[in-house]
Interface confidence: low
């Protein structure tokens, strides 16, 4: 039976230019994370993995960090990355979980106002 | 630490056969992606088989329908059955891990993080 819950950053905004982190967090269960997978969309962006460390997609190495924690750091944002992010944690003997976290980056004039979504 | 070791490599004459082996320890095995690669020599090296999460299989042009990949998790053991071998099969060939994700089964060799040692087949008469 999974019991446990992902806890995410939710909505949030971010500056074309700046970098974001992408943060989820399992909770509520003992089960053993043995790999998170970051996702946009259908693409993949990232791997935690328990024993073998990062690896980040080849197409997103120059944009995209790993952490803090099993976190992921994007950079040098652009309209383009508004969308959907998913991070998947693969758990043994739960199975997985996912969390969903929407970001949208705003022009910098906007952003300047003040973040549309608020981080529950 | 993760680690894989490779056997059962040798020579062989062209048409036979081998079997090669990879003990793979340090870590939970049915978690990950695993795959072949090879080497031969002056030349890249490329992959040659992979099995993957659900027990997937995928295969280079080269080998299709004369290798077969195949893994025993309760003894945490990789294998490559080789048939019908020819010269150019010839290589050091190596064992490689590669984290579980969503993606295909494929054989980028990016994708796998973690190598063993090689096992060199020579096939000569």
């Known amino acids: 039976m999974m019991t446990g819950t992902i806890e995410t950053t939710g909505n949030i905004s971010a500056e074309k230019g700046g970098s974001i982190i992408l943060q989820c967090h399992l909770s509520s269960t003992t089960a053993q994370v043995t790999q998170v997978n970051w996702e946009q969309q259908d693409q993949l962006l990232a791997i935690c993995n328990a024993d073998l460390g990062w690896h980040i997609s080849p197409s997103f190495k120059d944009r995209v960090a790993p952490g803090p924690g099993l976190g992921l750091t994007l950079q040098s944002l652009t309209v383009n990355d508004t969308g959907e992010y998913f991070c998947i944690y693969h758990t043994y003997p739960d199975g997985t979980y996912t969390g969903r976290i929407f970001l949208e980056v705003l022009e910098s004039s906007v952003a300047e106002h003040g973040a549309r979504f608020q981080i529950p | 630490e993760v680690q894989l070791v490779e056997s059962g490599g040798g020579l062989v004459q062209p048409g036979g056969s081998l079997r090669l082996s990879c003990a793979a320890s340090g870590y939970k095995y049915g978690v990950y992606s695993m795959g072949w690669f090879r080497q031969a020599p002056g030349k890249e090296r490329e992959g040659v088989s992979a099995i993957c999460s659900g027990g997937r299989t995928t295969y280079s042009d080269s080998v299709k329908g004369r290798f077969t990949i195949s893994r025993d998790n309760s003894k945490n053991i990789l294998y490559l059955q080789m048939n019908s071998l020819r010269a150019e099969d010839t290589a050091v060939y190596y064992c490689?891990?590669?984290?579980?994700?969503?993606?295909?089964?494929?054989?980028?060799?990016?994708?796998?993080?973690?190598w063993g040692q090689g096992t060199l087949v020579t096939v000569s008469s």
């Open positions: 490689a891990a590669r984290p579980l994700w969503t993606g295909d089964c494929d054989l980028s060799s990016s994708w796998y993080k973690t």
